[in-house]
Amino acid sequence: PPNRRTCVFFEAPGVRGSTKTLGELLDTGTELPRAIRCLYSRCCFGIWNLTQDRAQVEMQGCRDSDEPGCESLHCDPSPRAHPSPGSTLFTCSCGTDFCNANYSHLPPPGSPGTPGSQGPQAAPGESIWMAL
């Protein structure tokens, strides 16, 4: 039977707004990723900032509702915004426990002024786990 959806929770210092209220934080100790049990959806999200082929996690947590993309089993990020020249924000939504912890690859940002190469790439069949 399904459990309430549980996602990795992370918010980079200085990030505006918080999604902490969209779930209940689990007491996981210090050495494990922080986990949040979603209150209003069965969907996790992740946001990464890609700058010069280096990806940094910005936010991870629960979505406020189930919407397109939430049926995905894995985090497959797509480019969303350009917060500054040379950097691109990638976001993913997915609907399995802790699916927002990692991404298998970042697609090419594919827009003017941004390198068209793939972001940090995992070896075939592997995933990159974000170090939180």
């Epitope: 039977p1 399904p2 459990n3 309430r4 959806r5 996981t28 990723p33 979603c38 209150l39 802790f98």
Partner: antibody, heavy 113, light 112 residues
Framework: QVQLVQSGAEVKVPGASVKMSCKAS????????VSWVRQSPGQGLEWIGE????????NFNEKFKGRVTLTVDKSTSTAYMELRSLRSDDTAVYYC??????WGQGVLVTVSS | DVVMTQSPLSLPVTLGQPASISCRSS???????????LEWYLQRPGQSPRLLIY???NRFSGVPDRFSGSGSGTDFTLKISRVEAEDVGVYYC?????????FGQGTKLEIK
């Protein structure tokens, strides 16, 4: 087919600890929570806690917090539960379950002086 | 903690006849994600519990269609359309909506 095979019965004295195992097969161990439930003699069922094998994140019934440790060995697809500071009312059958759909055969733990 | 109250606690039934077990929770079991984490288990004598129903009304694989679950909010029912000898045992409702997850006290079904 999905199987959860638990370790054998244990007899312990009050104040001791017990660590039991639950070996999973027939599915991808890291994709499902492993829950632990106990059943005291002639009593109902009581949820102890759960662990997600992929990353070790666990969630507990407050009643057992501080006395229970849940761990996994991904290389052998085995989950473990340790219960410390045993009391006579911890005498029970302890079950592991794969996210509550498939259950192990149970481990009878008897706490007696 | 959420209290799960089952009735009746003992249920003598004639083979081939229907049976019904009620489960009431002290708080609503509908979660914010719209799902109701209510399950039913059967524990046959000397065996481990076995999942019958999850999400109020979804039969687990291999569970005969004579078992059905219904309800919402705080009131739930397990029905057996025609009781068979292998249905003897203790039936438990269980909620996974609120921490800690809790079980009902059990309903013992026996053949008259």
């Amino acid at each position: 087919q999905v199987q959860l095979v638990q370790s054998g019965a244990e007899v312990k004295v009050p104040g001791a600890s017990v660590k039991m195992s639950c070996k999973a097969s027939g599915y991808t161990f890291t994709d499902y929570w492993v829950s632990w439930v106990r059943q005291s003699p002639g009593q109902g069922l009581e949820w102890i806690g759960e662990i997600y094998p992929k990353n070790g994140v666990s969630n507990f019934n407050e009643k057992f917090k501080g006395r229970v440790t849940l761990t996994v060995d991904k290389s052998t697809s085995t989950a473990y539960m340790e219960l410390r500071s045993l009391r006579s009312d911890d005498t029970a059958v302890y079950y592991c379950t794969r996210q509550r759909d498939y259950w192990g055969q149970g481990v009878l733990v008897t706490v007696s002086s | 903690d959420v209290v799960m109250t089952q009735s009746p606690l003992s249920l003598p039934v004639t083979l081939g006849q229907p049976a019904s077990i009620s489960c009431r929770s002290s708080q609503s079991l509908e979660y914010g994600d719209g799902y109701t984490y209510l399950e039913w288990y059967l524990q046959r004598p000397g065996q481990s519990p076995r999942l019958l129903i999850y999400g109020v009304s979804n039969r687990f694989s291999g569970v005969p269609d004579r078992f059905s679950g219904s309800g919402s909010g705080t009131d739930f029912t397990l029905k057996i359309s025609r009781v068979e000898a292998e249905d003897v045992g203790v039936y438990y409702c269980f909620q996974a909506t609120h921490d800690p997850n809790t079980f009902g006290q059990g309903t013992k079904l026996e053949i008259k």
